[in-house]
Amino acid sequence: TPTTLASHSTKTDASSTHHSSVPPLTSSNHSTSPQLSTGVSFFFLSFHISNLQFNSSLEDPSTDYYQELQRDISEMFLQIYKQGGFLGLSNIKFRPGSVVVQLTLAFREGTINVHDVETQFNQYKTEAASRYNLTISDVSVSDVPFPFSAQSGAGVPG
């Protein structure tokens, strides 16, 4: 259940700018788009954190800055999408431009669509600012096209 997702398993790749945080993904027989045979829908989400500055620390997953920001974002998304269909997030990437955050969200198929992913994220902006000191802007959400990119790090058990 979603309440078990707080303890993410993590894998890091110090040679790249991404960090995967992939909780175990369970399967369902719901149907929606985009879809995999395992019953999981993925959504790509990008947003700006305008009150932070990008620096080289965000290219190194071993740094405190990287780890603290990654942890806060993971906690924030567990809070935003605390509902039965949310399976977790993966493949957090940081980019220059204040700080641009890119990540992939996983849900049970049929439990949410791209518009509601964005609505629920936008609804949380005020709380993100007060609870995590993250000023969020320029939110963009899109379906992850099938087949899901193998490099993304979002492994789905068969």
Epitope: T1, Y81, N113
Partner: antibody, heavy 117, light 107 residues
Amino acid sequence: QVHLQQSGAELVRPGSSVKISCKASGYEFNSFWMNWVKQRPGQGLEWIGQIYPGDGDTNYNGKFKGKATLTADKSSSTAYMQLSSLTSEDSGIYFCARGYKAWFIYWGQGTLVTVSE
Amino acid sequence: DVLLTQSPAILSVSPGERVSFSCRASQNIGTSIHWYQQSTNGSPRLIIKYASESLSGIPSRFSGSGSGTDFTLTINSVESEDIADYYCQQSNGWPLTFGGGTKLELK
């Protein structure tokens, strides 16, 4: 299977309060939002708000802020809605409903609240 | 708030006919619309989610379509058990809102 059992009909006086319940079974109560929906006699549906039993977080329709208070008891898997300062406009059927955060697949049978002298 | 307008208020049909219900949103809501059926003295029942996604246990004669602001629920061959009120609900904006409903009745 999932079942939502609501408390029985209430006849209450104007100005008083009433607390109705929705006992859930057949799923992990803490992990799904519980919603409340109002239906006036012969009228349509109005979303009142929702509570996440896992941590007590709530979202309300602004129209019902100050009127409805949502709570949940994890130990008994029961959600509650208290309606205060009742008037005739509060008469109607109140449903609890569970789905995901924003749509509802499981519904209680409804609780009729009648506000009358 | 997102306003949902359903039309007509009442639809009169004969068994076996094809019938369509309309739901119009006051702003673009993508495909974040859900349809419910409510029989007399009963609780609402979800019959279509996210504009066109079917649910297990719902007869295949029910289908949904549309995106943006205009949505349609279709029953391709009405049966007597389908006589009920039908509501659309949006989830693209808070608060969640319902349409005013369309009553399906027999001629």
